[in-house]
């Protein structure tokens, strides 16, 4: 009924978790808009209450928590289902209070179906693995806290619809899977499912994450630029459209922004009174080296604009480059009536 | 607590056929495979094939192939086996058995099919 | 298919003994074997997935151990309601396929 820091809904965190499957869900209050944890605000007398909006429905609810064999249960800032049913969709609010303070945050949370191969509406994490570059791991993710320590579980690694056996360079080993040497045939989604008995009852935890194989580092060089160069040169008559593709490889490189840029006389294009326009195209290669073209254009060409500089700048984590075009000014062709006749001595 | 009640004993004449069923509690009847399998009199237990209810994709043994037909109701969270052109080598119990992967975890009480002329 | 052979069809032994029920596949599995009990009444029941992984609820007197080919039950302290036949199920490549399964009585 008082005021309360409703911080909305925190669409940032779109959790999505499979049917018949555990899910622990933390509080976003600690981990985003709170400057406190938990245990700090419990100990100060603060309590936290959940609470859910269903699927399609306006109207707030408490969270059930005596369901059958405690299915939905809270422990500390952890809201836990054991395991999900498909009608457990909505949006779930924790909301932290006492009599002189209130803060809370709504978060949508989505229970999806998968088929027989794991296929499901999942946003999938993607893991980048270098090409043919010794062993690399994945690990099954978001299982921690879900079982302790003293549990075993049992982890089946899939890849697509197979169980990951008997492969070449793909070993299973418990909650990792190594790569002995990633190949282009290695890309596809990922599958580990972590089975676990608890109170008399057993769980699966399935996640799937695609992996995409990229270019090595060892393999990565500067910025290459193939176009402009020496061998074209951009002769054109004042009145024509001027076109200068600037074309760049750049190899692969975790993070790195490679960047491809145009000057005209030492100065970027919108500072130069020149009625001038760039598009860009991006292309990629199987392992993700990037090939970017960028196209300068000037509709009516003056013989001023003939006689700029036009330099093509490229960027990356690897270094920078810069090459400049070689732009002239067509010689008119000679007219024959009199330029000729003329040279032939003609009277 | 999963929970997989099936049909009761069948007693059919050489050539005909039988729909057996498996009806599913307390877990996720679509996101789990039923398996199907066979136990002959005083003898072991054969895999005859399974179905993920969720898309109805099914996988057979070879030998069922043609002799077994496996379809789910998803909405009554029911398993079906069809045993077509039956004959005396028909004769036995059959069992479901879920399994959320490749392991039949939770398995049904088992149907007796008798072939008899 | 895989072929999974229970070289013993039947043994007796005697309450609170250990007993060790053995189990092999025609080629290598990868752990991918699966132990069940089917009770004098019919009832069949999962123990052990992937080759040691007690299943919920099963009483910790059960163990399976193995690996390639070469696989094992153990019931460290045999109890009366042990009693049952004991099946081995590989589950590395469709179709799945059980061994020919153990009798266990008490002697």
């Known amino acids: 009924s008082e005021r309360c820091d409703d911080w909305g809904l925190d669409t940032m965190r779109q959790i999505q978790v499979f049917e018949d499957e555990p899910a622990r869900i933390k509080c976003p209050l600690f981990e985003h808009f709170l400057k406190f944890n938990y245990s700090t605000a419990h100990s100060a007398g603060l309590t936290l209450i959940w609470y859910w909006t269903r699927q399609d429905r306006d109207l707030e609810e408490p969270i059930n928590f005596r369901l059958p064999e405690n299915r939905i249960s809270k422990e500390k800032d952890v809201l836990w289902f054991r395991p999900t049913l498909l009608n457990d969709t909505g949006n779930y609010t924790c909301m932290l209070r006492n009599t002189t303070y209130c803060s809370k945050v709504a978060f949508p949370l989505e229970v999806v179906q998968k088929d027989s191969c794991f296929n499901s509406p999942m946003k999938l994490p993607v893991h980048k693995l270098y090409i043919e570059y010794g062993i690399q791991r994945i690990t099954c993710p978001n299982v921690d806290g879900y079982f302790p320590s003293s549990v075993k579980p049992t982890i089946t690694w899939y890849m697509g619809c197979y169980k990951i056996q008997n492969f070449n360079n793909v070993i299973p080993e418990g909650m990792n899977l190594s790569f002995l040497i990633a190949f282009i045939s290695n890309n596809g989604n990922y599958t580990c499912v972590v089975t676990y008995p608890e109170n008399g009852r057993t769980f699966h935890l399935t996640r799937t994450l695609t992996v995409k194989v990229v270019g090595s580092p060892k393999n990565a060089v500067p910025p290459v630029i193939h176009s402009p160069n020496d061998h074209v040169v951009y002769e054109k008559e004042p009145g024509e459209e001027l076109l200068i593709p600037c074309t760049v490889y750049f190899s692969f490189l975790m993070d790195s922004r490679n960047e491809v840029w145009w000057t005209i006389d030492g100065k970027k294009p919108d500072d130069i009174p020149i009625d001038v326009t760039i598009n860009e195209s991006i292309s990629h290669s199987r392992t993700e080296d990037e090939t970017r073209t960028q196209i300068l254009s000037i509709k009516k060409v003056t013989s001023e604009d003939l006689k700029r500089s036009y330099v093509c700048h490229a960027r990356s984590a690897k270094g920078e480059v810069a090459k400049a075009a070689t732009v002239k000014q067509k010689v008119p062709a000679p007219r024959y009536t009199v330029e000729l006749a003329c040279g032939f001595g003609a009277t | 607590q999963v929970q997989l009640q099936q049909s009761g004993p069948e007693l059919l004449k050489p050539g005909a056929s039988v729909k057996i069923s498996c009806k599913a509690s307390?877990?996720?009847?679509?996101?789990?495979?039923m398996n199907w399998v066979k136990q002959r009199p005083g003898k072991g237990l054969e895999w005859i094939g399974r179905i993920y209810p969720g898309d109805g994709n099914t996988h057979y043994s070879g030998k069922f192939k043609g002799k077994a037909t496996l379809t789910a109701d998803k909405s009554s969270s029911i398993a079906y086996m069809q045993l077509s052109s039956l004959t005396s080598e028909d004769s036995a119990v059959y069992f479901c058995?879920?399994?959320?992967?490749?392991?039949?975890?939770?398995w049904g009480q088992g149907t007796s099919v008798t072939v008899s002329s | 298919d895989i072929q999974m052979t229970q070289t013993t069809s039947s043994l007796s032994a005697s309450l609170g003994d250990r007993v060790t029920i053995s189990c092999s596949a025609s080629?290598?599995?990868?752990?991918?074997l699966n132990w069940y009990q089917q009770k004098p009444d019919g009832t069949v029941k999962l123990l052990i997935h992937?080759?040691?992984g007690l299943h919920a609820g099963v009483p910790s007197r059960f163990s399976g151990s193995g690996s390639g080919t070469d696989y094992s039950l153990t019931i460290s302290n045999l109890e009366p309601e042990d009693v049952a036949t004991y099946y081995c199920?590989?589950?590395?490549?469709?179709?799945?396929?059980f061994g020919g399964g153990t009798k266990l009585e008490i002697k």
């Open positions: 080629q290598g599995i990868n752990n991918y």
């Open positions: 058995g879920e399994g959320y992967l490749d392991p039949m975890d939770y």
């Open positions: 992937y080759t040691s």
């Open positions: 307390g877990y996720a009847f679509s996101s789990s495979w």
């Open positions: 199920q590989q589950y590395s490549i469709l179709p799945w396929t």
